[in-house]
Amino acid sequence: MMCLECASAAAGGAEEEEADAERRRRRRGAQRGAGGSGCCGARGAGGAGVSAAGDEVQTLSGSVRRAPTGPPGTPGTPGCAATAKGPGAQQPKPASLGRGRGAAAAILSLGNVLNYLDRYTVAGVLLDIQQHFGVKDRGAGLLQSVFICSFMVAAPIFGYLGDRFNRKVILSCGIFFWSAVTFSSSFIPQQYFWALVLSRGLVGIGEASYSTIAPTIIGDLFTKNTRTLMLSVFYFAIPLGSGLGYITGSSVKQAAGDWHWALRVSPVLGMITGTLILILVPATKRGHADQLGDQLKARTSWLRDMKALIRNRSYVFSSLATSAVSFATGALGMWIPLYLHRAQVVQKTAETCNSPPCGAKDSLIFGAITCFTGFLGVVTGAGATRWCRLKTQRADPLVCAVGMLGSAIFICLIFVAAKSSIVGAYICIFVGETLLFSNWAITADILMYVVIPTRRATAVALQSFTSHLLGDAGSPYLIGFISDLIRQSTKDSPLWEFLSLGYALMLCPFVVVLGGMFFLATALFFVSDRARAEQQVNQLAMPPASVKV
């Protein structure tokens, strides 16, 4: 009884998680032959989704300390009574701590919304930027490439830092940094296009810090289904932020009568969010939610971390699957609006476009669909996984695999439907994207399960690097290249403009099927890799510092 009181006091978490945490603590206590009363033993009472005893949950507005726990045989805390290092300290109120974690997750999700809002505000006013700076298409491509490349390069660096240093400080600094750069970029004179390119690169670095580290904090604040839910909220920020970015870009431009003002909105919100992160997000220890407390230390080198990740088959296959998602979303996002416009030209419901932007209406509809399907996909994926976990331990990768394979079918149908019905094509896009986006949060959750806490930031970073490198960094260009190649061997006509792009885009469903296969491969190794990660976590938490991971 003492244990459950302690767990609920610490967490205010879900009952099933408390029970699960209790079972794990009993098991670990038995393994170690730990003394102490009840289930708390040598571990202390870390409730589901919250730090173990002995952790100090710090915010700028104060800190909550709970009972320190020594290794077996050392004087620990009798029962689960939370003691403080100063006189008159009280047990924290359960609800406030639960609310605190909820607030932290909300702030982190808001930060992610802003990350994508900032990125897509630029996309929303890209034509204006091109017009103002006299940027050619290759220049616009350079802006995109510089952003992605700097993001890719910076991600592993922040992964390394995120596993070793204060994450919320890195997060806040990242937000402050990209906010300042974006704000400054709105004042770049027309002749300094290179400064605009540089600013996009710097924004990529700033945003990499966030995308890499924020999910790992959520991973350390919550466990099990609560973590899935919170990661779902966090990843829903991607379509929400993207959609809001387009809206912000165009509406602020119209309201102010000058596109420059569009780039001054997200930095202001960014500064506020960065400050809120510093104040409200607890400086969680790695492995908080895994009941590891102070005992879990990062003892491995970056090289060893990388070797361990590359040997982790579930991680490798899920990362390759994520690359397939990234490949498809990057290519479809760039080319589908133009493809649908060309379809309408063939159907004689639209004129041939000689002066860009071509397919502006289609871009808007596609953007709205992407935004909504992102939300629907994340919710569907999280819900399906929750339900499937009751049936199988391999639920996470299997749900992703089914989503991917189902998505491939509907992406194929886009090209069938577009020949005769634009509405039909949009329906296929809707279903296909919903299924494609259903694995966003689950993939992050898979990573949390199979990677130990001290490697999670590095793992997220490497996965981010891989998915960009093999995915959206090259897919838009590859599709364009294939389309041009097909067109060169055919006669110049609106029909072949439409067909050549359609044939090129058919590469996407094949890549998505490949991604589905990678998720099925993940399912093969998921249970064993998850068990190995749990075992390593248990070993790391044990007193001998010589444990090799």
Epitope: G134, K136, G139, Q190, F193, P356
Partner: antibody
């Protein structure tokens, strides 16, 4: 040496059409944005139309006063830029200059770094 | 459309004097202003780009300054070949527009 040579000017009646041509040499034409600028007798300079390069989808931009009547086009194989002028009016009487925009590969300046010698177009009944 | 106003319309100076020609924009245009010289019966030529950047082959006595809405073209010690019409042009936004010009004449 950069050279821009305009041809095709002359005396025409209001409502009629005329096509100006600008032959270029001394630079990579296909990568360069080109414009037409005009100057009415004894008056100031007025930008007429701009055509971007193929890397910008050969996008065209026009001054409000000639929109719908004039069309700018280019032929990269001949290194020529054209200005098709339809429904000409008295106020279109001017010297028409073919101009080049300075190119920086990834982007282009909107100012004119080279000008042709100009061609006179007179619209009169 | 951005309107450019040049002043004075005509400026009379003696050779060897230094002069400043003004160009004012109807709204802030950062440094997106360019200066051209047009001698009698000749095509215009670019003197200064982006408010202050010099152009190869243009004498160093020509310099530009300003940002936002107010811009200056300075000619240090005017020479006889400098007597011509000077135009400013904005490239901040389309349509591209020119100022009405300032005529520099011999006093």
């Amino acid at each position: 040496e950069v050279q821009l040579v305009e041809t095709g000017g002359g005396l025409v009646r209001p409502g009629s059409s005329l096509k100006l041509s600008c032959a270029t040499s001394g630079f990579t034409f296909s990568d360069t944005w080109m414009s037409w600028v005009r100057q009415a007798p004894g008056k100031g300079l007025e930008w007429v139309a701009l055509i971007k390069d193929k890397n910008s989808n050969s996008e065209a931009n026009y001054a409000e006063s000639i929109k719908g009547r004039f069309t700018i086009s280019r032929d990269d194989s001949k290194s020529r830029v054209y200005l098709q002028m339809n429904t000409l009016r008295d106020q279109d009487t001017a010297t028409y200059y073919c101009t080049r925009h300075e190119d920086f590969y990834y982007y282009s300046g909107y100012y004119f770094d080279y000008w042709g010698q100009g061609v006179m177009v007179t619209v009169s009944s | 459309d951005i309107v450019l106003t040049q002043s004075p319309p005509t400026l009379s100076v003696t050779p060897g004097e230094s002069v400043s020609l003004s160009c004012r924009a109807s709204q802030g245009i950062s440094t997106s202003i360019h200066w051209y010289q047009q001698r009698s019966n000749e095509s215009p030529r670019l003197l200064i780009k982006y408010a202050s950047q010099s152009i190869a082959g243009i004498p160093s006595r020509f310099s530009g300054s300003g940002s936002g809405t107010d811009f200056i073209l300075s000619i240090n010690r005017v020479e006889s070949e400098d007597f011509s019409v000077y135009y400013c042009q904005q490239t901040y936004s389309l349509p591209l527009t020119f100022g009405p010009g300032t005529k520099l004449e011999v006093k």
